[in-house]
């Protein structure tokens, strides 16, 4: 099993709509896979593939989960707000016939706010 | 490019037990998402799939082999191995190494096969 | 274990023609989860390793001439030469990848006639 994902990194406007992608292959075919995203270490969803459809279709606030065959799990952030921002990491395991995990490697997600001086305010709080 | 050439005795007496080695080339056997089997075609041109070690030393083997099989990895050679145990005249063939992916799963570069004959 | 039976055991074809090789699954190879067939076909000169055409059934692998074409879906197969060519004389194989045991098909032995 071997889990890609995509992009690295994604900058986006506060209210916009952000898409992060996972693509799942494995070898041999599978009757039920486990899917998960985190944000920052927390689980936003757990559901399962089998049958070519999601479990659930909905992924922590505002996210929408999807499956398009073969092989992409995508999750749709829309509209996207500040506490998006954070590290996203996709998670698969094949239950059935038998277990094999692996996950992604991680989506910074960085959310600009809608008003500039925001951003301006947020860019000099950092330190250096 | 990834370079598969199988390597060992090309005679085994009966009971003994057979072991080969896969030097890989120009790819690391440790790659997520590769899988490297060792295949058997029979002097009939029969083929069969003996088993599989992954990226990760996991390994898969058929089971009309029973326990006979054992395939390893030494990723600092860069190599597999295959063992198969209490062999019989059953067991002549052409031994070859090949690689699949879990993107493409299928075996697309193979070993050029070494011919192990069982005899006393 | 998933058995694969190829049909006919040989073929002799006349330059030019078209020919036919059939391969039949035990059980079916289509997964709903990734509307993939896992099938894949391969071809085999003599003192050569095998070398891949054709993947999940129907799509032919970067470089191979457009002649040979997959076809089916669930339990039964056909590899497609459009038009034989000398060079196209070789064995011929099918394979599944939906579970282990992977297994193969006993073979097509292609001749011209």
């Known amino acids: 099993l071997s889990v890609q994902q995509g992009p690295n990194l994604l900058q986006v406007r506060q209210g916009s709509q952000a898409t992060l992608v996972c693509q799942v292959d494995q070898a041999t075919a599978w009757e039920r896979l486990r899917v998960k995203w985190t944000k920052d270490g927390a689980i936003l969803c757990q559901p399962y593939i089998t049958n070519g459809s999601l479990s659930l279709g909905v992924c922590g606030p505002q996210g929408r989960l999807s499956w398009q065959a073969p092989s992409h799990l995508t999750l749709q952030l829309d509209p996207v707000s500040l506490n998006h921002s954070g590290a996203y990491v996709c998670w698969a395991a094949v239950e059935i016939p038998e277990l094999e995990e692996a996950e992604g490697n991680i989506t910074r997600l960085f959310v600009d706010p809608d008003d500039p001086t925001q951003n301006r305010n947020r860019i000099a709080s950092f330190p250096g | 490019q990834v370079q598969l050439q199988e390597s060992g005795p090309g005679l085994v007496k009966p009971s003994q037990t057979l072991s080969l080695t896969c030097t890989v080339s120009?790819?690391?056997?440790?790659?997520?998402?590769?899988?490297w089997s060792w295949i058997r075609q029979f002097p009939g041109k029969r083929l069969e799939w003996m088993g599989y070690?992954?990226?990760?030393?996991?390994?898969s083997y058929n089971p009309s082999l029973k326990s006979r099989v054992t395939i390893s990895r030494d990723t600092s050679k860069n190599q597999f191995s295959l063992k198969l145990s209490s062999v019989t005249a059953a067991d002549t063939a052409t031994y070859c190494c090949?690689?699949?992916?879990?993107?493409?799963?299928?075996?697309?570069?193979w070993g050029q096969g070494t011919m192990v004959t069982v005899s006393s | 274990d998933i058995v694969m039976t190829q049909s006919p055991d040989s073929l002799a074809v006349s330059l030019g023609e078209r020919a036919t090789i059939n391969c039949k699954s035990s059980?079916?190879?289509?997964?709903?989860?990734?509307?993939?067939?896992?099938l894949n076909w391969y071809q085999q000169k003599p003192g050569q390793s095998p070398k891949l055409l054709i993947y999940?059934?129907?799509t032919r692998l970067s470089g191979v001439p457009d002649r040979f074409s997959g076809s089916g879906s669930g339990t039964d197969f056909t590899l497609t030469i459009s038009s034989l060519q000398a060079e196209d004389v070789a064995d011929y194989y099918c394979?599944?990848?939906?579970?282990?045991?992977?297994?193969f098909g006993d073979g097509t032995k292609l001749e011209i006639k």
């Open positions: 090949a690689t699949m992916a879990d993107r493409f799963a299928f075996f697309d570069v």
């Open positions: 120009g790819f690391s056997i440790s790659t997520s998402g590769y899988y």
């Open positions: 070690i992954n990226y990760g030393g996991g390994t």
């Open positions: 059980q079916s190879l289509f997964s709903s989860n990734t509307n993939r067939n896992y």
């Open positions: 999940h059934a129907s």
């Open positions: 394979q599944h990848h939906y579970e282990t045991p992977l297994t």
